[in-house]
Interface confidence: low
């Protein structure tokens, strides 16, 4: 499929002009090469009338011109002074070549239509309404009026001043007169629909002496605006209907064929094909809403429609608005995952790409709410506050310059699946889809902190441990201080951590973070994450909650409380500034030699350790200052 | 859910001046436009000016030169410096913004309950 878009049918009348947008791929290439405008030809070979070159053929001279729009992605074909000989089959395109990429235009010109003398002519579209002015002298001011129809020879009556109306315009045509106005009668047909179309006559008075107007209707189907959007962006329909149906429901809806089948609506319907990725907004008082459809999909794309009806659904003679969807697959928006998998306890790491020349824009993370319209309340964001009930276990992680963000979950639930989006107040088109799938755990976490019940003491030394499993041995470990803005990575110190080892002990991989001394202010959730440059991994956090020391109580040094039998030698020392005094994650030397002492009394049994361990006596120590 | 509160508008001599303000509140999470629009008696509403988020204005013909739109992103609020008022400035004025909350990411259009400006001698 060609990534080149235009109006597939372009229709005009003699003498008139019209105005063809092409749409190409947003490519250094496309914006610079050259753009053209063919006639196609039955022998196959099509001419070129008007390229971006500057040529410009005889039949076009001082009536055309192709304007390039390289900031939309766009141009545009105008030509003037139609006649019936420009009715037939073009291509717009791109290339060197009239051969390169192309889409096929219809362009159809008619003759102008001939009406009788004096015809008012009168141009709505579909589901509005239309007054018809009928002027007459005064001799007839209290004679009969009417509305007629004109079909072949007859003129059908639709309405008269008796009362009478057409069972077809019934509830929807009024016949009435303004104020004191003594020489014109009005009629109002509401409600248009195709059908309507056509020459109408009005009239005051019989025979020779009565008055009569004519009136060509033209009631028009809605000219589709052209949205032209990449796989997997996202697309909004601003549909602003009237003020005259701002109480209706709302709806929009994609045509099939012969109907238009509801994708969502105020009433509550929407297509399953569409759950978790969009959304209705109303966006004023008056009607005006919008729709927006998040990763965009191959098959969305298509003929959509807008409307209101007390009902939510596609009703003739209701306003509507249209538009082609057309998604070029030649996306610049990455392929990123539309399923994340989790399990209870556990964390995911979600990477949000956003338009890398906007890496100063807000970005943000929302929850999509099947709800009415759906919704999509703000979790986290880059100047949000993160939401009640994600409090120690949300996080947005900016990567300023390169294309994307992460946000991490942790402490899963099976109430966390659903859709997110990630969102910047950017480029709209940069909004992804996600669906966080959580199911039951089966087995322990990959991260395991000691102690579980973890309370600091003022002025003491405090250690939590988090234990791995090899699998992340080569991997950075860290530990962070959550906040309401964000986790932050506390500094760290490791030696000998990422030596070459022979084999891993499952059981004996740990990172460990120290506060020395305690203060009130260390209260709050810690994370411990393992990553891989700016790629976030599995993480898992823990409160520490910060006490008094109890007058007469014994003095237990935590560090020693905390240690586990299960507790390996296999440490990387973390050194936390969380504060710009001395309050620094110093690493007690004595916590190792007693860690390794209970491991290894635990741990006769084991044969084969590897020497070459990355954690062994020599190779480790504390963070010095 | 997001309030506009307009101030500054009164009573002054043509020739005069006049600071309006507009403060923005509410679950708001970004502002993209926020601008001023003025509805005479008996006339449509009409745009006076309008400061975009990347800091781009564009002002209505009949205001150049003499009124200046600025916008203060921290506070969420927008101001409009009217000088040498004319009697033809008499209007209700009215402030816009383009507002994502927390609750919809899509913008949307709120507006102000409008202040008064009268230019008469």
């Known amino acids: 499929q060609s990534p080149i878009f235009g109006p597939q049918d372009v229709s005009s009348i003699e003498g008139n002009s019209v105005s063809i947008t092409c749409y190409y791929p947003d490519t250094s290439v496309n914006r610079h090469t050259r753009k053209y405008w063919c006639r196609q030809g039955a022998n196959g070979y099509c001419a070129t009338l008007i390229s971006s070159n500057g040529y410009l053929s005889k039949e076009y001279s001082g009536r055309a011109s192709l304007i390039n729009f390289p900031e939309n992605s766009t141009f545009v074909i105008n030509i003037a002074h139609l006649t019936q000989e420009d009715t037939g089959s073009y291509k717009c395109g791109l290339g060197t070549t009239n051969r390169g990429l192309f889409f096929d235009v219809s362009l159809e010109v008619s003759q102008v239509p001939e009406f009788p003398n004096d015809t008012h002519v009168y141009t709505k579209d579909i589901g509005r309404t239309v007054t018809i002015e009928c002027r007459f002298k005064e001799g007839n001011a209290h004679s009969k009026k009417s509305l007629c129809k004109k079909r072949g020879e007859a003129c059908e009556v639709v309405i008269d001043s008796t009362e009478y109306v057409d069972p077809s315009y019934k509830d929807r045509a009024i016949l009435f007169m303004k104020g004191t106005s003594r020489d014109i009668f009005y009629v109002n047909i509401s409600h248009l629909i195709p059908s309507d179309a056509g020459l109408y006559v009005c009239q005051a008075g019989e025979g020779p002496s009565a008055d009569k107007n004519n009136a060509d209707l033209q009631v028009l189907e809605p000219e589709p605006e052209l949205l032209y959007k990449d796989l997997r962006s996202s697309v909004t329909f601003e549909c602003d209907l009237g003020r005259e149906v701002a109480n209706d429901a709302k709806y929009l809806c994609r045509k099939n064929k012969e109907t238009c089948d509801v994708i969502i609506n105020t009433l509550g319907k929407r297509d399953p094909a569409f759950e978790g990725r969009i959304l209705l907004t109303p966006r004023d008082d008056n009607g005006r809403f919008s729709v927006l459809i998040t990763g965009l999909r191959k098959e969305d794309a298509g003929h959509y429609q807008c409307g209101a009806h007390s009902s939510g659904l596609p009703q003739e003679g209701w306003p509507v608005q249209a538009w082609q969807l057309f998604v070029n697959e030649e996306s610049t928006i990455p392929n990123s995952r539309s399923v994340v998998k989790g399990v209870t306890g556990g964390s995911v790491a979600i990477v949000c790409p956003y338009n890398p020349k906007e890496s100063s824009s807000l970005k943000y993370w929302c929850h999509w709410e099947a709800d009415e319209n759906g919704r999509c309340p703000v979790l986290v964001g880059t100047q949000a506050l993160v939401q009640e009930g994600y409090e120690g276990r949300l996080a947005l992680f900016d990567q300023p310059g390169s294309g994307a963000y992460t946000v991490i979950l942790n402490q899963l639930t099976t109430q966390d699946s659903g859709f997110y989006w990630c969102l910047t107040d950017g480029d709209s088109r940069w909004r992804t889809t996600i669906e966080l799938q959580v199911a039951e755990a089966t087995k322990k976490p990959d991260l395991e902190v000691t102690p579980q019940n973890a309370t600091a003491v003022i002025g003491e030394t405090f250690t939590i441990s988090c234990h791995y499993p090899c699998k992340f041995y080569s991997q950075e470990k860290y530990w962070c201080k959550w906040s309401n803005d964000g986790c932050h990575i506390l500094p760290s110190h490791d030696e000998g951590a990422r030596q070459s080892s022979v084999s891993c002990d499952q059981s004996s991989q740990i990172v460990s973070m120290t506060l020395n001394p305690v203060k009130k202010e260390d209260e709050g959730w810690y994370w411990c994450g393992v990553k891989e440059g700016q790629v976030y991994g599995e993480t898992t956090a823990i409160y520490v909650a910060v006490e008094e020391r109890t007058r007469g109580s014994p003095h237990i040094n935590p560090t020693d409380a905390n240690a586990r039998a299960k507790d390996a030698p296999e440490e990387e020392a973390m050194e936390s500034s969380v504060r710009e005094d001395e309050n620094k994650a110093n690493l007690d030397p004595r916590l190792f030699a007693d860690e390794r002492e209970i491991q290894n009394a635990g741990d006769q049994a084991q044969e084969n350790r590897a020497s070459g361990n990355a954690g062994s006596a020599g190779g480790q120590s504390g963070s010095s200052k | 859910e997001v309030q506009l509160v307009e101030s500054g508008g009164g009573l002054v001599q043509p020739g005069g001046r006049l600071r309006l303000s507009c403060a923005a509140s509410?679950?708001?999470?970004?502002?993209?436009?926020m601008g001023w629009y003025r509805q005479a008696p008996g006339k449509q509403r009409e745009l006076v000016a309008i400061?975009?988020?990347?800091?781009?204005?564009h002002y209505a013909d009949s205001v150049k030169g003499r009124f200046t739109i600025s916008r203060d992103n921290a506070k969420n609020t927008v101001y409009l410096q009217m000088n040498s008022l004319e009697p033809e400035d008499t209007a209700a004025y009215y402030c816009?913004?383009?507002?994502?909350?927390?609750?919809?990411?899509?913008?949307?259009?709120?507006w102000g309950q409008g202040t008064q400006v009268t230019v008469s001698s």
């Open positions: 509410g679950s708001i999470f970004s502002i993209r436009d």
């Open positions: 400061f975009a988020r990347g800091g781009s204005t």
């Open positions: 816009n913004a383009e507002v994502a909350t927390m609750i919809q990411p899509g913008f949307r259009d709120y």
